[in-house]
Amino acid sequence: HTVELNNMFGQIQSPGYPDSYPSDSEVTWNITVPDGFRIKLYFMHFNLESSYLCEYDYVKVETEDQVLATFCGRETTDTEQTPGQEVVLSPGSFMSITFRSDFSNEERFTGFDAHYMAVDVDECKEREDEELSCDHYCHNYIGGYYCSCRFGYILHTDNRTCRVECSDNLFTQRTGVITSPDFPNPYPKSSECLYTIELEEGFMVNLQFEDIFDIEDHPEVPCPYDYIKIKVGPKVLGPFCGEKAPEPISTQSHSVLILFHSDNSGENRGWRLSYRAAGNECPELQPPVHGKIEPSQAKYFFKDQVLVSCDTGYKVLKDNVEMDTFQIECLKDGTWSNKIPTCKIVDCRAPGELEHGLITFSTRNNLTTYKSEIKYSCQEPYYKMLNNNTGIYTCSAQGVWMNKVLGRSLPTCLPECGQPSRSLPSLVKRIIGGRNAEPGLFPWQALIVVEDTSRVPNDKWFGSGALLSASWILTAAHVLRSQRRDTTVIPVSKEHVTVYLGLHDVRDKSGAVNSSAARVVLHPDFNIQNYNHDIALVQLQEPVPLGPHVMPVCLPRLEPEGPAPHMLGLVAGWGISNPNVTVDEIISSGTRTLSDVLQYVKLPVVPHAECKTSYESRSGNYSVTENMFCAGYYEGGKDTCLGDSGGAFVIFDDLSQRWVVQGLVSWGGPEECGSKQVYGVYTKVSNYVDWVWEQMGLPQSVVEPQVER
């Protein structure tokens, strides 16, 4: 009878064991274990009847198609075999064991005691068959194994071979190299590779196989295993395989598909090909006069590009348009995309106008072409070139007028300051009385007229100021403050301010320049109680033209000490002392209550301590601060009552040889003007130089040299 065994281990004994087995007996044990295991059989006891070639009693071990062993007897002889210590190993997961005894036994035989167990098959070691073994890596586990692939490869659906994903290769460059995967190492199995060469229309792809060509083939059948096919439009070239590379292929197409197929076996090194684009040839090129062509080649083909450029100082001219370079291209029909342009000398054209300046040409015929030279100069004596620039500009290769220091920027003509068109009188002789000023003696003098038309009746008053530049007037803050507010400082509205420059005689305003205000800027810390920081600026609506009667005064250097005691300074004014005079009377009628002609007075600077003491000795809150200085005579007699508020107190600066505004007429009192020991108080301008430059939007370094010269 047959016994089916399915356990992973077990014991088999002869019938009746350990007693003697019966005669004429036959038992078969079929052992089946799971796939991935084999069966190991060994005997602990064996005692059967001996016979030649085990004809009588025996134990036979077999698989489905193979006898693994036949055992009988007690000990091994030449013609019979006992298992002894031998282990029987099945090749697969099945083993059949048959015990047979014949009809007679001369002795009592005890039979056998056998054991079996399932043991793991190490498929990775034992698979010799290429068809079954792993392509790259094999991993054994109890009861089975699995395969894996090297980096860049994918396990095929057969779970054994390693393929690559190579169906998405696009080549658009005009030349390139294409190889089988992993070349020159053996190419992967079970792969379908697709390479597309897609060039611009007009190109034709030429293919050339190189180096090694090794694709699995067959002696009789053409390329049944692995192969290359080349598809050009509807036409297919190939298949190609073996060890002989195809001849160079001229596809006559800009689009080519290369298919490479490998099956699941074989170890071949693969292939490599280079491709290049071919196109139509274009005619030879001649560079233009004063120009060159890059790159310079013997031949040019479709898609080749050349850049036409000109020598320094020349520009490419194409269809009347100037450019730095011009590119032309070889077209697919073998013609150039454009004619070669010409090279034209660079022209900087007419140089830019210089405000308050003029231009002279150094080159004959007023040439404005490359390397021509011009010279800018300022309208002297009213303007001077900033930083003493040479003013020389050369026409550059870029087509712009260039100066060595300023580059393409134009020079700046700054108003000359503190240089009247006629000399101010010598300060050696002390003049006690005020006197008429000659025209042009105080060209910075400004008459400021404020007419507040927003009130009924209209409020109107006057003050003086000093021209600092073509656009800015310096004056006292109290001149531009609206007195209808006492607890706060409110500047007058710019619409209510008119400035007169170049005015000499108030009866004749025809020669004067009048300007509206664009901005009124009071010092933010101006104090109406003690007139500390009594300084302000008016920006004019338009810059005024400078000339002999309109020129700026210089600002001082930043010096907290201010003007030195006993220095003589000049103050000018029209002496508008009658508060009931109207603007029309001032500007037109020349009422007798004021001086028609600009007056000036010479006054010495008073030591600060002396002035402070003189005011402290009076009853009242008079405060001579560090932002003020005093001028006048101890004995009185002359003062700036006749000079308008905000007017400039100027001192001649020996270093720069210019007149500098050191003070602004601010306040005085309480006794009548010109009283004994009543000094006029002036805003110390040198304390505000930075503030003034900041308001005017000019860095100090720009204008400082005016005074430093």
């Epitope: 007195q483 209808r484 006492d486």
Partner: antibody, heavy 116, light 112 residues
């Protein structure tokens, strides 16, 4: 110290004129305007107007236009109030006060009596 | 003209007690420059007026800090935290925002 010293009391007949002065000291005179304020007997204060001490331009409240004139003598730091064609209802104390709108310091007042 | 209305018109206060005077204007006193020109003054019996407060809440120098001003727009208040004998007199508010400047009718403060 800041002081506003007004002229003394006046007794005037109807139709006459009067000029009240207000001498200022202790500060920069042209820095502040000068206001004039009337106080009728037993009544409250009424602002008459002000004069800009820098420009000399006066501004009058509507009730004080015509017979009332503000003026200045800057050299002696003195504003003046002149009333012409006096009427009995002009009887009042007239104050000067420093400032157009500030009125931070006041004179001691001048009593003007109009009586026949 | 801007009408200034003070309340109460008279006030009798025990020394050491607080006092409060209200002043209302017929239109806002905030001017185009963002300032409010509302002031308070005291006229003691037989004397000329003396300004106490300007720009609503700023105290003039020499004015005791028991005085304080507050308000905005059209409603303003003068407060005395502890009234003293020297505080008697007539208190006026006035505005300097809209021409012509106008005074309140006055509030008479007496000591009980």
């Amino acid at each position: 110290q800041i002081q506003l010293v007004q002229s003394g009391s006046e007794l005037k007949k109807p139709g006459a004129s009067v000029k009240v002065s207000c001498k200022a000291s202790g500060y920069i005179f042209t820095s502040y305007g000068m206001s004039w304020v009337r106080q009728a007997p037993g009544k409250g204060l009424k602002w008459m107007g002000w004069i800009n001490t820098y420009s000399g331009v006066p501004t009058y409240a509507d009730d004080f236009k015509g017979r009332f004139v503000f003026s200045l003598d800057t050299s002696v730091r003195t504003p003046y109030l002149q009333i012409s064609s006096l009427k009995a209802e002009d009887t009042a104390v007239y104050f000067c006060a420093r400032g157009g709108e500030a009125m931070d310091y006041w004179g001691q007042g001048t009593l003007v009596t109009v009586s026949s | 003209d801007v009408l200034m209305t003070q309340t109460p018109l008279s006030l009798s206060v025990t020394p050491g007690q607080p006092a409060s005077i209200s002043c209302k204007s017929s239109q806002s006193l905030l001017d185009s420059e963002g300032k409010t020109y509302l002031n308070w003054l005291l006229q003691r019996p037989g004397q000329s007026p003396k300004r106490l407060i300007y720009l609503v809440s700023k105290l003039d120098s020499g004015v005791p800090d028991r005085f304080s001003g507050s308000g905005s727009g059209t409603d303003f208040t003068l407060k005395i935290s502890r009234v003293e004998a020297e505080d008697v007199g007539v208190y006026y508010c006035w505005q300097g925002t809209h021409f012509p400047w106008t005074f309140g009718q006055g509030t008479k403060v007496e000591i009980k």
